[in-house]
């Protein structure tokens, strides 16, 4: 948690924030972890500390290593670690995985791509944006503040996007680039009449008296986020909460589990210490949404414990 990976390219600016955050009034000391040598705060140095920030202006491959920051309040000292790796510039266009920031997803309605780490830098608009190393041109692309907006997003817009900007420090300019992948997701959702995947209709579930038993009610309702969808259990047509048997409880399983893009819900019925009278009850798995309600009924039957001695008679 308090060790953070940071990376950059040689001859570009890199600014790293101490992963251990403190109040603005707290002092922060930076050290090279390997030597415990203090990092200077004087801005004339190529690598210097400035409060919560460690600045490489510009970075060199030899700067790679672990840096320690100690945040000091009047009564507490707390430590963080920045694991910095500086890479040589690639001669070809491909951006290797180790230089990529987190992937972002977009859709027709939301197609913002934020420039990673830009908030750490002193930069001025506009940002330059590239896709797969080609400068972006055309009215569909708009560089706005620290992000790129793509109008009328299509699946072909997926790819690696690089932002390039200039960091200014005391009148000197340093280049910074950052790349992240952009994926396009289809937001075409729909809603169906509920489909119960489990249990099967009129299923007989074998249980052992005195043991615990679980019944899972699982149903799918369509694709994408569902406005109204629920699964629940009933006992003899009565809600579990109203039935009044503390041994029998229901709890949500995986919520909105999008397997194959489908929006599904699970509800697990837990029966503790199964009793004879539980075999007489009717267990209904109910799935409902705006289209209507579907019910699958389960009954319990006694499972005779295997008499291991008799096997070898």
């Amino acid at each position: 948690k308090f060790s953070k990976q940071s990376w950059g390219l040689e001859n570009e600016a890199l600014i790293v924030r101490c992963p251990r955050q403190g109040k603005p009034s707290y002092t922060v000391d930076w050290y090279y972890s390997q030597t415990n040598k203090s990092i200077p705060t004087q801005e004339r140095n190529r690598v210097f500390a400035s409060g919560q920030l460690l600045k490489f202006l510009p970075a060199a491959v030899a700067d790679s290593g672990i840096y320690t920051c100690i945040v000091r309040s009047p009564t507490f000292n707390r430590t963080g670690y920045a694991n910095v790796t500086i890479y040589k510039k690639q001669s070809d266009c491909n951006v290797p995985d180790y230089l990529m920031y987190s992937t972002v997803s977009g859709s027709e309605k939301n197609s913002k791509i934020y420039c990673p780490t830009i908030d750490l830098y002193n930069w001025t608009a506009p940002l330059e944006w590239f896709k797969n190393c080609q400068a972006l041109q055309g009215s569909r692309y708009r560089a706005h503040k620290s992000f790129l907006v793509i109008d009328n997003v299509m699946t072909e817009d997926a790819g690696d996007y690089t932002c390039k900007f200039i960091h200014n420090e005391n009148g000197a300019n340093y280049s910074v680039t950052a790349t992240r992948s952009f994926t396009v997701k289809d937001e075409q959702g729909f809603s169906l009449f509920p489909v119960i995947g489990a249990p099967a209709q009129n299923e007989i579930k074998e249980v052992e008296i005195g043991k615990n038993a679980n019944l899972t009610c699982s149903a799918c309702f369509g694709k994408g986020t569902q406005f109204l969808a629920a699964v629940l259990w009933q006992l003899n047509g009565t809600k579990i909460t109203d039935f009044g048997e503390p041994r029998i409880q229901q709890e949500e399983g995986q919520n909105q589990s999008f397997s194959n893009g489908l929006a599904c819900l699970d509800m697990v019925l837990r029966i503790a210490d199964v009793k004879e009278e539980d075999l007489l009850l009717q267990y209904d798995c109910l799935a409902l949404n705006l289209h209507g309600l579907r019910r699958h009924t389960v009954r319990l039957s006694r499972k005779n414990p295997i008499d291991h001695h008799s096997i070898y008679c």
Epitope: K1, F2, Q21, G22, K23, S73, T75, F76, R78, T79
Partner: antibody
Amino acid sequence: EVQLLESGGGLVQPGGSLRLSCAASGFTFSIYDMIWVRQAPGKGLEWVSTIKGEGGGTYYADSVKGRFTISRDNSKNTLYLQMNSLRAEDTAVYYCARDPWSTEGSFFVLDYWGQGTLVTVSS
Amino acid sequence: EIVLTQSPATLSLSPGERATLSCRASQSVDDDLAWYQQKPGQAPRLLIYDASNRATGIPARFSGSGSGTDFTLTISSLEPEDFAVYYCQQYIGAPITFGQGTKVEIK
């Protein structure tokens, strides 16, 4: 010297209400996160609620959510806990405490505690 | 919610002996763990923060260690004033939670 002084405890019937206060002194109250922690007789410590510093965001334990409200008056250096719909299981010594570090969305230790005020919920 | 389990529930030792208290978390809390001491009729007192750092004014005989899910508070040589209840607390996220406590009593 940092000091926290709770008041407002007492005997209350189930379903009743009580308002606890915690007067703070010796530090810049407004910038610190403040916390209520309770301890039932003979039992361990249970976090009740946190209110962040200037931002004022609030957090509650599930056991008190919807019934208790934490608030602060930075001009009076005072922390409050409004307790409604009290239950027997709310009987405890209530401590107010200071989180000396927290930044937005994070939590830390409690470095100063009050002496506590006893709340008894009984008919 | 992260559950902290302290062991043993009670530790019976003599002054001068070494006390080793354990705190286990139900999931990783990194080093976001503190130890407190509480004496009867008093509020808890912070001993250790960030798993291993002693709070201001805490004697060097108290030390903390561990990371992730397993943590230890060690009192190298018990003084008469150290007999009390000790609690661990995690603060990696809300809700912050405490262990149920370990009582260190005089044998």
